[in-house]
Every structure is written in C-alpha cells, then in structure tokens.
Interface confidence: low
C-alpha cells in the first residue's frame, strides 16, 4: 500500500472546494433540546448567501428547522438529527462553518436557551424540592472528547422555588475554578461549560435545596483527549474482484478521520504506454473528488457496464492535514465465459458481480461534477 | 493517562539478538501502532519500523530489513522489537512511541516509552 | 527517502529570548511536519504536528510555520526548562519516517 506518495493526475479534475483552515466545532445536545449553531461571516464582512447542510445534503425549512443565513436551530432534537453541520457560501459551496452534533440522552452538551425546565409555580402549597425531569438524569458518566461544551441539568421545582449551587470533586464551583469560566443558568437549572479540556474531568454536584428540603445529584465527566491522526481506511471486502463484461462493479472503503478527509477514487492509467511519469511517480486520473464532512464515512465507486478497458488498478484515497492513507482494489473484467469457467472458485468468494445491468441517471449521480472527461468515462457513473 | 513502560538495560555480544518489549496502557492498544526509534549515544534520532497492533501488519526502515522483527500481544498490551545479528554500531537507546494510526505509520508520535539502552560489546 | 535538513545545529541563547529553528525538506511534504523536544537522558516530546498545531499540554511559546518545505519553529521567549535538542520529522511519505539532524539549544 503507497502511502502519501505523490501521483501525477491525468485528465481534467473539477477543483472541490475545501474548508475554511480551523477545526469542526463538536456539539452534544441532549434529545429534545433545541440545537443552535451560529456562523458569523468571516472576518465580520458580508455573508453573501448560504445553505445550509447536513451530511452533505441541503436543509429544507420546517416548523422545526429554523433556517437564517448565520443561524440554523433545530428544535425538539432527536438521535436523527445527529451528523456533521455545514453552512457554506451558495456559489462556491465554501464552507464557512462545520460542526459535529451529537444527540444524546440527558445530561446534554451544548447551551440551548429553550427555557423548558423554567421555576414555574406548580400549584402545591409547600413542599421540599424534587427533580421535574428524573428521566433526564439517568447519564451519570458523559465523556466527550476535549474542546465540546458540556451542559449538566437537574430541572427541578419546589415551594418556594429551590436555589441551585454546584460542587467540582466535593467542593464549591465558581467560574473562577477553570479557564474560560463557567455559565450558570438558574432557570433552566444548568451548569455551561464551553471547551472542556482534561483538568475540567471530575464529580459534578447540583444541590438543590428550599427551607423544606434538599436534593442532590452527581455527574461525572470525562474528558477524552483526541490523538491527531490521519485518516484510517477499512477496505470494503472484496478487494479484488473479477467482473463480466457489462456488468456493474462496486468498491466501498470506509474513511474514518477526525478531521475532514480529502477523499479521491482513482485509476492507475497508461500515457503513451507508460505507467509512470519521467520522475517515477504513477500516472492516476481522478474518478471522484470531494471532502467528508463526517468522522465515518462509507465511499463507494460504482462502474456500470464495464468494459476491459475498465481492468486494472483503483484507489481508494483520504487526506487530512495530518496525512495521506489509501487502499489498492483490482479489478479483472472478462468476457462471458472466461468468467463463467471461473465463476464456482470466485463466487466463494464472493468477488464475481454479474448482476444485471443498471442505466444510472444524471440524477442518481446527486448533480455532482464529472472530474475527468466524458470521453475518458463514458459510462462510468459514480455514487 | 497513557503510559508506555519499556525493559529494562541489556549488554550484548555481537552476533547475539536481543527483545525489547513495551507495555502500553491507558488507551484502546489495537487501535493504533507502535513505532520503534533508536538513537545511538550523542546522534540523531532514526526509525526503526513500525507495527499495526490491529492486523499485524509491518513497515521496517530498509537498513533493518532482515534483522529487525515487531510483534505485540494484546493479551498483555505489549508491544515487542527483536533485533538479531547485533552489531556494535547497534549500541543505543531504543524507543516505543505511540503512533495514532492502526492503518499506516507516519503519524506524529505522541506517546513515548522511557527507553531501553541496548549495548552490543565483546 | 526524504531527507530533513535543520539549521543550525547548536544554538545559544538566553532566558527570555525569541529563537527560531528552521527545517528544510528534500521534497514537498504539505503540512505532514512535526517537531519534538529532547532533553538528555529522557524520550522526545511532540510540541507540534502537521506543522503549526499545538500538541495539547504544550506551552503557548512554542509555534510552528511553514508547508512545502520550509517549515520554521519558533520560540517566542526562551524559558530554563526549554534547553534541549529539537527535532523535525515529515510523516508525509513513509516509510521510512525521516527526521533531523536535531538542533541543539544551549543557554548563553
């Protein structure tokens, strides 16, 4: 396996817009929370129009999604809203702003202001405090990975309406404590804190208390500090594959980076009957080109109606700013029955595709752009 | 937190081979690697090889070809270099560090053991 | 191979000092550069990967430049604790991971 070695790219490859330099902001909400994400313009100046996207698909308004162009909320999150967050410039699809939102169960990250656990006077005459929501603190342990914001909540109500404080470790907690301070909501019985780093790890206690009465409840958190890493590429099996003529061949490789990968499928291809250039490096032409906006992502490269021409040597390619990571996939094609003699020794395993074929349309390529000529790809379509 | 602890010192005559191992804790081993780094008394650092703890797979410096060998066990979350055929220009101090790939080296090392100086003498 | 050239190869300066250490490399190698600090007897220590990123831990003085192959670190104002041999690694063709020569940081 070649390893962040330079390629000579043939053909005309589309430039993908890349991410602006800065690192993807991880939010973790709880469900039912309102997600909230803001993108300032950058440098303060005009924004221009924007879209906003989720894994790589445009938000549609709705009752629940907000959409403005700085400002997306998502109300009444649940797990399905989970994903990478993207709001880019409508033109150039630049992106402007990335987040990873996680919806969990309570306690949640993140700092919504939805004000649903508001003091409110619930009609008793007195009586000693008691939790509103007990099925949102049923998470004792959160570990999030460094620089998230962490939301701890114990909703709670009481006659009179209960003071709330916080202990780190046992002891009082101020915002003095940690650098970057801390957010106390009373109303909404919250502990903020914006950017977790590992000192912030430890016991955190709501007490909860009237003149009738006290109640307490204790989180932990964990903080995980992240390892920078280039991308991890899992190749999908099999990854050699022998083909009839006319049938469509699928290669997948799952890319696993914290960062936002770079991820190309290329083709090792012959110019004037070389392999390589003068300075040794292969010749390559780029079949797909674009950047992953999700920590996991599932790529597939999808030929239909192979030719012989289509044989040979396909990578599977991921670049973050830490490094370069590919896989290798080969492919044979034969004519009807050169695969049919052997077809019972590759069906076991399972590197035969001969299924029927498939016309894909303009519309099953999701509109993206053709990065190498249509002469040079003539039938081969892309999911 | 995460902790690499090497072997102890080791004398060796040349010709004789000789394994070091690393013990990793405080993260998941098989999801990255190990690489392996020497520095001869007063010299620069150079890379031995590195080993993916996940599949096993091996990437050895070309220099070391043949006599170097890598291996781990995650029963124990130790990680092993054996170098055989010792010579005396093979005196130095021997380093694990963490490599945060399981995939492919290159990473940068962020975790390092404390060394372990191997002196090859007759 | 890459090789990785670092200058200079001593160095002496005083407490509250800036200091800079280049590194040059072969060939392109992106931003794929990170530099460690090695105090005697003890094991390197990452400061800075892919080039210009702090490694969490590490104090504010210490910042990184440079993509291609020219790459720079910089020390904005020498402490005690900062005498030690620097060196440069690229992790943008492996293998072999190469490194430099080191730079080695002595007080004035």
């Known amino acids: 396996e070649s390893l962040g070695t330079e390629q000579r790219v043939v053909g005309r490859a589309a430039e993908v817009p890349g991410p602006e330099p800065g690192q993807q902001e991880q939010l973790v909400f709880g469900s039912g929370d309102a997600v909230e994400l803001s993108c300032p313009p950058p440098g303060g100046g005009p924004m221009g129009p924007t879209v906003w996207v989720k894994d790589g698909t445009g938000l549609v308004p709705s009752e629940r999604v907000l959409v403005g162009p700085q400002r997306l909320q998502v109300l009444n999150a649940s797990h399905e809203d989970s994903g990478a967050y993207s709001c880019r410039q409508r033109l150039t699809q630049r992106v402007l702003c990335h987040f990873s939102v996680r919806v969990t169960d309570a306690p949640s990250s993140g700092d919504d202001e939805d004000g649903e656990d508001e003091a409110e006077d619930t009609g008793v005459d007195t009586g000693a405090p008691y939790w509103t929501r007990p099925e949102r603190m049923d998470k004792k342990l959160l570990a999030v990975p460094a620089a998230n914001t962490v939301r701890f909540r114990c909703p709670a109500a009481g006659n009179p309406t209960p003071s709330i404080s916080w202990l780190k470790n046992g002891r009082e907690f101020r915002g003095e404590h940690r650098i970057g301070g801390i957010k106390l909501r009373h109303q909404q019985w919250s502990l903020v804190m914006e950017s977790v780093v590992p000192s912030d790890r430890g016991n955190y206690t709501c007490v909860v208390e009237n003149k009738f009465g006290s109640i307490r409840q204790t989180y932990t958190l964990d903080v995980l500090e992240r390892s920078p890493h280039r991308p991890i590429l899992q190749a999908g099996l099999p990854a050699n594959q022998t083909a009839v003529l006319g049938s469509d061949v699928e290669f997948h490789c799952k890319v696993y980076s914290d960062a936002q990968p770079h991820i190309q499928w290329l083709k090792h291809v012959e110019v004037n009957g070389s392999k390589v250039g003068p300075d040794g490096t292969p010749y390559v032409t780029v079949l797909k080109s674009w950047i992953s906006e999700s920590v996991e992502a599932d790529v597939r490269l999808r030929l239909a109606n192979v030719s012989e021409r289509d044989g040979g040597e396909y990578l599977c390619r991921a670049t973050n700013f830490i490094g370069v990571a590919e896989k290798a996939f080969w492919l044979s094609v034969h004519g009807p029955r050169a695969a049919e003699e052997e077809l019972v020794e590759a069906d076991e395993a399972g590197s035969v595709y001969a299924g029927e074929q498939k016309l894909i349309s303009e519309e099953d390529l999701g509109g993206e752009q053709k990065l190498i000529s249509e002469e040079d790809l003539h039938h081969h379509h892309h999911h | 937190q995460v902790q690499l602890v090497q072997s102890g010192v080791e004398v060796k005559k040349p010709g004789a081979s000789v394994k070091v191992s690393c013990k990793a804790s405080g993260y998941t081993f098989k999801f990255y690697g190990i690489s392996w780094v020497r520095q001869a008394p007063g010299q620069g650092l150079e890379w031995m090889g590195w080993i993916s703890v996940y599949n096993g797979k091996t990437k050895y410096a070309q220099k070391l070809q043949g006599r170097v060998t890598m291996t781990t066990d995650t029963s124990t979350s130790t990680a092993y270099m054996e170098l055989r055929s010792l010579r005396s220009d093979d005196t130095a101090v021997y380093f694990c560090?963490?490599?945060?790939?399981?995939?492919?080296?290159?990473?940068?090392?962020?975790?390092w053991g404390q060394g372990t100086l191997v002196t090859v003498s007759s | 191979d890459i090789q990785m050239t670092q200058s200079p190869s001593s160095l002496s300066a005083s407490v509250g000092d800036r200091v800079t250490i280049t590194c040059r490399a072969s060939q392109s190698i992106s931003s794929y550069l990170n530099w460690y600090q090695q105090k005697p007897g003890k094991a390197p220590k990452l400061l800075i990967y892919?080039?210009?990123s702090l490694q969490s831990g590490v104090p504010s003085r210490f910042s990184g430049s440079g993509s291609g192959t020219d790459f720079t670190l910089t020390i904005s104002s020498l402490q005690p604790e900062d005498f030690a041999t620097y060196y440069c690694q690229q992790s943008y063709s492996t293998p072999p991971i190469t490194f430099g020569q080191g730079t080695r940081l002595e007080i004035k």
């Open positions: 560090a963490r490599d945060g790939d399981y995939e492919s080296s290159g990473y940068p090392f962020d975790y």
């Open positions: 892919a080039a210009s």
